[in-house]
Interface confidence: low
């Protein structure tokens, strides 16, 4: 089990590092997006796991971005952000609409809008229960 957890972490790390770099190979990214969306978590240990991924970086030093699957909809009151940015991209994470042609990346206008917890604990619990 420990080996399985280590292997899973390695796969997730590679997925995060390569997120959005190849529009033709998105299966791992979609799977991880789905994990974040379902478990209401972001990143492996912390949401900050995403902050140094180059494809997610904007031009400014503070331009931190995360996949839209990290977005906590219940914490967001800004309807403009929801309607124009988040919902159209999160709608692709449903069971029926899983395909996409580019990485779904959202700016972080306030980091309180993203899930604060990493996914490692939730996934490890899931592994132990199965």
């Amino acid at each position: 089990r420990a080996q399985l957890e280590r292997s899973l972490r390695d796969v997730v790390e590679k997925t995060i590092q390569k997120y959005g770099t190849n529009p033709e190979e998105t299966a791992a990214e979609e799977s991880w997006d789905y994990v974040q969306f379902q478990l209401r978590c972001c990143g492996w240990h912390y949401p900050q796991d995403w902050f140094q991924v180059l494809i997610l970086r904007g031009n400014g030093s503070e331009a931190h971005r995360v996949p839209c699957s990290c977005y906590n909809l219940s914490a967001t009151n800004d309807s403009t952000i929801l309607d124009k940015v988040i919902l159209p991209q999160l709608s692709r994470l449903g069971h029926l609409a899983r395909s996409r042609h580019s990485a779904d990346i959202c700016a972080v206008p306030a980091e309180s809008h993203i899930y604060r917890e990493g996914c490692a604990q939730g996934l490890q619990k899931w592994l132990h229960n199965n």
Epitope: Q48, D49, S61, E62, A110, E111
Partner: antibody, heavy 120, light 110 residues
């Protein structure tokens, strides 16, 4: 512009106290772990303390009980309260923003530093 | 607490040289290591995180490697701007959360 600016350094007598401030601009301090790192004249870097985004504090063994890290999110400012100061605390104190990556921490943004001199 | 030992403490080199700095941890820290560059009178500048990852804007001539207890920073072709002091930092966010810096390596002009 994203930056950190320290203040509050100066000359203090042994046994005295000092409070350092670090004003953040261009980003919200409350969303980050923040830390203090010091450097004695002509010496290397020495980790002092960190306060995480939830407010939990961590200290180097030698700093426990004498130094207190805190933050005022409404002022977007980090503090380091230093008590019972000794000559060996003489150093430039840097405020730094901490990022985390897969359980690993590092400091991606640093202030210019403020010099603390402890001498009679 | 983990102790970080850097070597050499001083290194004389010329522009264009390949330079290697090593950092040894007193206990296993996996890949939880960062490197910084510091010039006199300036704040440290963040160079490498998670042992081998370059942040946005750091030139590709800088390369970090290693895991466990042995780590290396390599500058493939030293540039005039690279003469500085380099520090490694253990960065394991465990239950104790104590960070530690190496003693530094000064890269000076030969």
């Amino acid at each position: 512009e994203v930056q950190l600016v320290e203040s509050g350094g100066g000359l203090v007598q042994p046994g005295g106290s000092l409070r350092l401030s670090c004003a953040a601009s261009g980003f919200s301090l409350s969303n980050y772990n923040m830390g203090w790192v010091r450097q004695a004249p002509g010496k290397g870097l020495e980790w002092v303390s960190v306060i995480d985004a939830s407010g939990t504090t961590y200290y180097a063994t030698w700093a426990k009980g004498r130094f207190t890290i805190s933050r005022d999110n409404s002022k977007n400012t980090l503090y380091l309260q230093m008590n019972s100061l000794r000559a060996e605390d003489t150093a430039t104190y840097y405020c730094a923003r901490e990022l985390l990556y897969f359980g690993s921490s590092y400091y991606d943004l640093w202030g210019q530093g403020t010099l603390v001199t402890v001498s009679s | 607490d983990v102790v970080m030992t850097q070597s050499p403490s001083t290194l004389s080199a010329s522009v264009g040289d390949r330079v290697t700095i090593t950092c040894q941890a007193s206990q296993n820290i996996d890949s939880n290591l960062a490197w910084y560059q510091q010039k006199p009178g300036k704040a440290p500048k963040f160079l490498i995180y998670y042992a081998s990852n370059l942040p946005f804007g750091v030139p590709s001539r800088f390369k970090g490697s290693g895991s466990g207890t042995e780590f290396t920073l390599t500058i493939s072709s030293l540039q005039p701007d690279d003469f500085a002091t380099y520090y490694c930092q253990s960065a394991d966010v465990g239950s104790t959360y104590v960070a530690a810096f190496g003693g530094g390596t000064k890269v000076e002009i030969k």
